[in-house]
Interface confidence: low
């Protein structure tokens, strides 16, 4: 019998856990009769008979393999089902005749581990630690044999590096015989690692070859001291009164420091802390010109009690002050002239416009509106608009009412009204003038007067149509200190032969006609805003 050392290497059979291993007895006919074979398992150099073949018939021996062995291929192959990690051993077949020969088979068992599970250190890592700190843990469950782990940072494999990178791996054997691998990556991190992507890779082998599985990528919280704090204002660009403005503190440290936002008191030059919301944001809503000023942010590291101050940031909330028109309530005689001057202050250059209130017509671009040879029609509203052209929506306006002295002026001189006898008639009469006139009627009825504007009045009369009324008609008389004027309403009975009233007659309220608004040549003068007083 040749010595052990001279035995040929066993045949290698590779299978996955749970599958069937086909153990083919490689004895040639000259080495032994395959109809008379004993199968052994060898574990720790101890042989255990597990199966007998006699006259081509197989018989399991009692024990761990009793239920899982069967003969195939006319008795030359022993099939082992439901392979487990514990089956990784040498199996040998031994022929009995003509001489005792044996053939060895090395069974190798494989099982792919589950997807690696990676857990980042939730407490994070300070950059100034003296030795490597735990970054993440990688667990690969139920693999066989033990898989190899490789750690990656930003796609590059990490290697052990004294005092910088340390990989600590351990494994446990499950009751199934499968391995669970746990690998802990410890490293000294720097600030730039705050965005680094870490993952682990498990390398393992199957009968089909080498394989690998990757975990998801994770980032680890990296703690580093704040070196700089700064202010950010939203929205960016020109701000105006009424805007919602948010001022927030930002820092380049992690965790960020405790923030406070201060505004310099313009009189004391002291920084006064502002009240921020729960997120540490100072919300100015609506922003006012008083919010303008110098803001700064203080970041206090609550661990070290080191305080950092941001660069101050000047905030300008642009505004237009109340618009002032002079004279405020002008009264003029017909034929005279009037100069209206508009004033306002702003943080930016202002543009002025004068509009006719009733029509919206632009009369002048500039702060001064000159009206010459005033007619009665020139009475009414004039609006000054002060706007900042560089900031859309930033404007203020002021309306001024121009009164032209004159006796009452009737909206109509006479009018025909179609009526039925015994109906209650609703008549109206409108007059304007300065001083504002009052209206009286020549018949009894229920009258009510409404002021339309400072120079215009509308009177409404409810009256019963009687034969006498039909005969006399109705007059309304408007009077003021400068005179009186009358409008006549002729009442006509509606009968079957009456034609449809033409466009010059009405059955309801009379309305005033639109008057043309004229203005003479006007010039505008340029006006400089007052300079702010300098500090003493």
């Amino acid at each position: 019998v040749p010595g052990e050392a001279e035995q040929p290497a066993p045949e290698l059979v590779e299978v996955e856990v749970g599958s069937t291993a086909l153990l083919k007895c490689g004895l040639s006919q000259s080495q032994g009769n395959l109809s008379h074979v004993d199968w052994f398992s060898v574990h720790k150099e101890k042989r255990t008979l597990i199966f007998r073949v006699r006259q081509g018939q197989g018989q399991s021996e009692p024990g761990e393999y009793e239920q899982r062995l069967s003969l195939q291929d006319r008795g030359a192959t022993l099939a082992l089902t439901q392979v487990t990690p514990q089956d990784e051993r040498i199996f040998l077949c031994q022929g009995k005749r003509p001489r005792s020969q044996e053939y060895r088979i090395q069974l190798r068992v494989y099982k792919a581990p589950e997807e690696p599970n990676i857990q980042v250190n939730p407490l994070g890592i300070p950059v100034n630690s003296k030795e490597p700190e735990e970054v993440a843990t990688c667990v690969g469950r139920n693999g066989y044999p033990i898989p190899q782990v490789i750690w990656y940072k930003n796609g590059r494999p990490l290697k052990e590096e004294k005092n910088r990178v340390h990989i600590q791996s351990s494994q446990t054997v499950e009751s199934s015989g499968l391995y669970t691998l746990q690998s802990i990556l410890k490293a000294q991190l720097v600030k730039e690692d705050k965005d680094a992507q870490f993952y682990c890779e498990l390398n393992y082998r199957l009968p089909s070859g080498n394989h690998m599985k990757e975990s998801r990528e994770v980032t680890v919280p990296v703690f580093y001291p704040t070196e700089k704090v700064w202010l950010e204002v939203e929205p960016v660009g020109m701000l105006k009164e009424g805007d919602r403005v948010e001022i927030r503190c930002l820092a380049d440290g992690n965790p960020p420091p405790h923030f406070s936002i201060s505004k310099q008191n313009p009189s004391t030059r002291e920084a006064e802390e502002e009240t921020t919301n729960d997120n540490g944001v100072l919300v100015l809503e609506p922003a006012r010109k008083e919010h303008s000023g110098r803001y700064e942010c203080q970041g206090l590291d609550l661990d070290t009690m080191i305080s950092l101050l941001s660069e101050p940031q000047e905030l300008l909330v642009n505004y237009v002050s109340d618009v002032r028109v002079s004279p405020a309530a002008p009264e003029r005689q017909e034929g005279s002239s009037l100069t209206l001057t508009c004033e306002a202050e702003s943080s930016q250059d202002l543009e002025f416009q004068w509009l006719r209130e009733e029509t919206g017509q632009v009369l002048e671009r500039g702060p001064v509106l000159q009206l010459h040879d005033l007619k009665r029609e020139a009475g009414g509203g004039y609006r000054c608009v002060a706007s900042v052209p560089s900031i859309p929506g930033l404007n203020r306006t002021q309306l001024v009412n121009v009164a032209i002295f004159g006796p009452p002026w009737m909206a109509f001189k006479e009018r025909k009204v179609w009526v039925k006898e015994n109906m209650v008639l609703n008549l109206s009469c409108e007059a304007s003038g300065h001083p504002r006139p009052t209206i009286s009627w020549n018949v009894n009825g229920t009258a009510s007067e409404q002021d339309q504007d400072p120079q215009r009045v509308l009177s409404t009369l409810n009256v019963l149509v009687t034969p006498e009324l039909l005969e006399t008609g109705v007059e309304c008389t408007a009077s003021n200190d400068l005179g009186k004027n009358t409008s006549i309403l002729f009442l006509e009975l509606v009968n079957l032969t009456t034609l449809t009233p033409d466009s010059n007659t009405t059955t309801g309220l009379s309305t005033s006609t639109a008057s043309p608004h004229t203005r003479a040549n006007s010039t505008s003068t340029e006006r400089k805003l007052p300079e702010p007083e300098s500090r003493g």
Epitope: P266, S267, T268, R269, E270, P532, E533, S534, R535, G536
Partner: antibody
């Protein structure tokens, strides 16, 4: 040129209230750039800052006098005032009003208030 | 409050000589410091603000320096009208506080 002028009684009895007014001319008290202060100087001694008022009415008083001091402003009259209650002989001093910014550039000429029965 | 300490209490100098007055703050006041001159029966007069900026109309012989806690007022060549009491005052914190004064007298 901004000018300040203190006015008020020169003699106040102990336990009473000292009242002084400062009238500002040549500039508006409502100019938001400055604050308006009261400062006093005990005979032969140094200067002691009493408190200030801003045109909007916000004030700050020296903690050592806070319980007894009230400063008020009347922008329509361009004046601000000092009231110091429960006075004693130790409150005898020359009282100045001044306009504050980066230091006090403009001062009143000062008024001597003696506390004596 | 911030305590301002001036030294010396009295400085005897001959006309034409240089005078150097010191002021120390108990904590930093940055450069928010003013110097005043006061003559008997008069209100103080602002000489220097911002630690080193001369107020309007103040002669060039007056100069200020320093920052933080240590400040100096220098009068390069004393004139007869410069003999007076000089005060420093901080305006970095409330309450505003003055030094106790340095009297510059004729030697």
């Amino acid at each position: 040129q901004v000018q300040l002028q203190e006015s008020g009684p020169g003699l106040v009895k102990p336990s009473q209230t000292l009242s002084l007014t400062c009238t500002v001319s040549g500039g508006s008290i409502s100019s938001g750039t400055y604050h308006w202060s009261w400062i006093r100087q005990h005979p032969g001694k140094g200067l002691e800052w009493i408190g200030y008022i801003y045109y909007s009415g916000s004030t700050y008083y020296n903690p050592s006098l806070k319980s007894r001091v009230t400063i008020s402003v009347d922008t329509s009259k361009n004046q601000f005032s000092l009231k110091l209650s429960s006075v004693t002989a130790a409150d005898t001093a020359v009282y100045y009003c001044a306009r504050g910014g980066d230091g006090y550039k403009y001062w009143g000429q000062g008024t001597l208030v003696t506390v004596s029965s | 409050e911030i305590v301002m300490t001036q030294s010396p209490a009295t400085l005897s100098v001959s006309p034409g000589e240089r005078a150097t007055l010191s002021c120390r703050a108990s904590q930093s006041v940055s450069n928010n410091l003013a110097w005043y001159q006061q003559k008997p029966g008069q209100a103080p007069r602002l000489l220097i603000y911002g630690a080193s900026t001369r107020a309007t109309g103040i002669p060039a012989r007056f100069s200020g320096s320093g920052s933080g806690t240590e400040f100096t007022l220098t009068i390069s060549s004393l004139q007869s009208e410069d003999f007076a009491v000089y005060y420093c005052q901080q305006y970095n914190n409330w309450p505003r506080t003055f030094g106790q004064g340095t009297k510059v007298e004729i030697k």
